[in-house]
Amino acid sequence: REPTIQCGSETGPSPEWMVQHTLTPGDLRDLQVELVKTSVAAEEFSILMNISWILRADASIRLLKATKICVSGKNNMNSYSCVRCNYTEAFQSQTRPSGGKWTFSYVGFPVELSTLYLISAHNIPNANMNEDSPSLSVNFTSPGCLNHVMKYKKQCTEAGSLWDPDITACKKNEKMVEVNFTTNPLGNRYTILIQRDTTLGFSRVLENKLMRTSVAIPVTEESEGAVVQLTPYLHTCGNDCIRREGTVVLCSETSAPIPPDDNRRMLGG
């Protein structure tokens, strides 16, 4: 039978660490992390790490009992937790019968937004006390709310992650940029900044209707290639809503004209 893994939480040092071992298995060959979305209940889910590792293909895996994975997160609150994955069988060959290295994966460790994680893994039995313990570590920074997986988190949807403003911005002339975007049903107030190294233009927008809106913004210097930053102020996130960006291009001859005054905003900073 092929070995599989059974994983469970292990806080503190592994019991094998207290025992002297004449021989120990080698280190891992590779360690990788990706995100997975797992359903918890209807319309509820959590984002977890899918941690996969590859064993070194040599006879030392005959001694391998388990692999221990620890994750520490550095954000507002530091976190640290470990799981121990026991191999259900002794390894009878250094590679899978079908070819390729022995590869295993564990899905767990809930992921917070925009957090730096250090994931480290080592084989058990590991090196004896006062000896170098071979372990493999990878850094992983979890993405923010605009990530295709993260954007469905409640924290993100409340900050406007599912809103697609579809920003277009074009330079009408040396002094004017036209910005078009789709408003958000959760709010009616926006700020628009046009920036290069400094702020070239600024506008505040109030718009109650759910619609495509257009704003003409005066600029102080060359605006082509500048970044347009659109910040919504929604009921659910107040001043902490997700900012969206676009780039100023030259207006084409066929670009839509600025709509009549009732839909047009030209509020200089």
Epitope: L23, A57, A59, S60, Q92, R96, S98, G99, G100, K101
Partner: antibody, heavy 118, light 107 residues
């Protein structure tokens, strides 16, 4: 049955390179590492040069040969290759390909290629 | 690298006798040891792996033993086809190394 076929001999000039082949049959090529072994002459000992995993082409060399041998595989034809570079008279030897078993005991051997540098 | 020291380097014996070849590793190889037989002008052939397991087709007069750093190959009632060279090899972790060989010749 498992077979590893190697050409009998190669004659090469000093400073030149040679690429030795090891054509396999009778087993799933990607399931076992392929090793290369040098035997310096009659009654002389065996030296492990390195190994390659045909599945993903991972290679491990004996440090002594890392600037001398280049291991490759061609999965489509189930063949392993070893290129020997900057040849000198010291490289004159019989070179064997040998397939690993479950671990790295060498369960099957090719007939060997005699390389003569002259 | 792990050194494999094989002894004796050569042995002259008669058909029907029993011989033992020994192999010492410079460190514990956890029983990851193989033995090979090589006849003149031929490629080596696997005899024994994992210290005691006989390869397919190997006669039962061959047997292996040992652990840690000390290993041996015993051939009971030598036959004429058993003459040739014998090598031990560890496969604990790369780089793999062979013993210097034992040349078994007919007395």
């Amino acid at each position: 049955q498992v077979q590893l076929q190697q050409p009998g001999a190669e004659l090469v000039r000093p400073g030149a390179s040679v690429k030795l082949s090891c054509k396999t049959s009778g087993y799933t090529f990607i399931s076992y590492w392929m090793n290369w072994v040098k035997q310096g002459g009659p009654e002389q000992g065996l030296e492990w040069i390195g190994r390659i995993d045909p599945y993903d082409s991972e290679i491990q060399y004996n440090q002594k040969f890392k600037d001398k041998a280049i291991l490759t595989v061609d999965k489509s034809s189930s063949a392993a290759y070893m290129q020997l570079i900057s040849l000198t008279s010291e490289d004159s030897a019989v070179y064997y390909c040998a397939r690993s078993g479950g671990f790295d005991w060498f369960a099957y051997w090719g007939q060997g290629t005699l390389v003569t540098v002259s | 690298d792990i050194q494999m020291t094989q002894s004796p380097a050569s042995l002259s014996v008669s058909v029907g006798e029993t011989v033992t070849i020994t192999c010492r590793a410079s460190e514990n190889i956890n029983s990851n040891l193989a033995w090979y037989q090589q006849k003149k002008g031929k490629s080596p052939q696997l005899l024994v792996y994992d210290v005691t397991n006989l390869a397919d087709g190997v006669p039962s007069r061959f047997s292996g033993s040992g652990s840690g750093t000390q290993y041996s190959l015993k051939i009971n009632s030598l036959q004429s086809e058993d003459f040739g060279s014998y090598y031990c090899q560890h496969f604990w972790r790369p780089p793999y190394t062979f013993g210097g060989g034992t040349n078994l010749e007919i007395k």
